[in-house]
């Protein structure tokens, strides 16, 4: 058993049918010695008397808020949560496996640049009685500070007969050095509590591996005289790291016909302009990627040919 926060304790339960459970001793936080009784949640049933209460925790029915009283007065509370292990594996029931980029991916994180700021998000089908707490650091043995805000509900979507809820959190490395080579990964730890169930989830990454630039901005077309060609131009996104001479992007320019089956013409360039043939009813799209490190491409920025 360990303390999650004041008066909230997590009991680690290795569960299997007929498991004996965990013996837990609760101590009433009071100088009183006599006339103390214990109850669980809203029940008035007395579970025991004395300054300590020994319970056998076998299942969620044994978790909850234990209260010690004396003469009708509440002395202290202890909320017991369960962290359940089955077949040697800690439960991961609260969050949904996003399966991207691999199975057992519960947390996904992205950064728009090298400033040390990043966003993580996760999915759940649970709508109520749910709380999250996020901590982060760079490295784990001698951790350097990363400050995370509160997790917030960022999206709701319907998937078949299921409603899915997306939560996200923004974090900022306290002493980020954008140009430095990373040697220690960022660690992100999410505590999730649903009703009386506690679970924890972790992710470990280098900022360079989670970079996804914003799409190029100010995408414009300039027709070339007496030609079907156009000059496409764009700019670096405002959120990208500066100076651009050091934090450089490479770009992919795509001409896509109205039909998805039509052949796509693609041009790759390090410049912020390109000359392409603009077909009728086609659109031109441009996306960006770090020039020197193959992290994610940005989403596309698009304009119609007409």
């Amino acid at each position: 058993i360990w303390e999650l926060k004041k008066d909230v304790y997590v009991v680690e339960l290795d569960w299997y049918p007929d498991a004996p459970g965990e013996m837990v001793v609760l101590t009433c936080d009071t100088p009183e010695e006599d006339g103390i009784t214990w109850t669980l949640d809203q029940s008035s049933e007395v579970l025991g008397s004395g300054k300590t209460l020994t319970i056998q925790v076998k299942e969620f029915g044994d978790a909850g808020q234990y209260t010690c009283h004396k003469g009708g007065e509440v002395l202290s509370h202890s909320l017991l949560l369960l962290h359940k292990k089955e077949d040697g594996i800690w439960s991961t029931d609260i969050l949904k496996d996003q399966k991207e980029p691999k199975n057992k991916t519960f947390l996904r994180c992205e950064a728009k640049n090298y400033s040390g700021r990043f966003t993580c998000w996760w999915l759940t089908t649970i709508s109520t009685d749910l709380t999250f707490s996020v901590k982060s650091s760079r490295g784990s043995s001698d951790p350097q500070g990363v400050t995370c805000g509160a997790a917030t509900l960022s999206a709701e979507r319907v998937r078949g007969d299921n409603k899915e809820y997306e939560y996200s959190v923004e974090c900022q490395e306290d002493s980020a050095c954008p140009a430095a080579e990373e040697s220690l990964p960022i660690e992100v730890m999410v505590d999730a509590v649903h009703k009386l169930k506690y679970e924890n989830y972790t992710s470990s990454f280098f900022i360079r591996d989670i970079i996804k630039p914003d799409p190029p901005k100010n995408l414009q077309l300039k027709p070339l005289k007496n030609s079907r060609q156009v000059e496409v131009s764009w700019e670096y996104p405002d959120t990208w790291s500066t100076p651009h001479s050091y934090f450089s992007l490479t770009f992919c320019v795509q001409v896509q016909g109205k039909s998805k089956r039509e052949k796509k013409d693609r041009v790759f360039t390090d410049k912020t302009s390109a000359t392409v043939i603009c077909r009728k009813n086609a659109s031109i799209s441009v996306r960006a990627q770090d020039r020197y490190y193959s992290s994610s491409w940005s989403e596309w920025a698009s304009v119609p040919c007409s």
């Epitope: 949640d41 969620f60 089908t125 009703k195 169930k197």
Partner: nanobody, 123 residues
Amino acid sequence: EVQLVESGGGVVQAGESLRLSCAASGRSFSNFEMGWFRQAPGTEREFVATINWRGSSTYYADSVKGRFTISRDNAENTVYLQMSSLKPEDTAVYYCAAGRLFPSSRSRDYDYWGQGTQVTVSS
């Protein structure tokens, strides 16, 4: 929301068997741990059995262990309670419940409930 409808109750002789079914509709059935409870007249609702969302783990009240079997079919959105060697003291209204905490024998840990099906065991 999850809607639960129990069926399969009836009157049987002591020692006989009965199979209860609980059909779920609404939100995705496979997200939920499922349980069976029962209530005899003048008594509190009593835990019978529960099964986790995968169908890989089960948990039973001592009073039914070895006689009752809970199972589920996530493709059919149905949970079953196979009851054998029935005794007169098994007479009760049987309720199906859906929740998110497994295992739990406490009724308030379940979020959705059916209307119940009557089982009567005569001696």
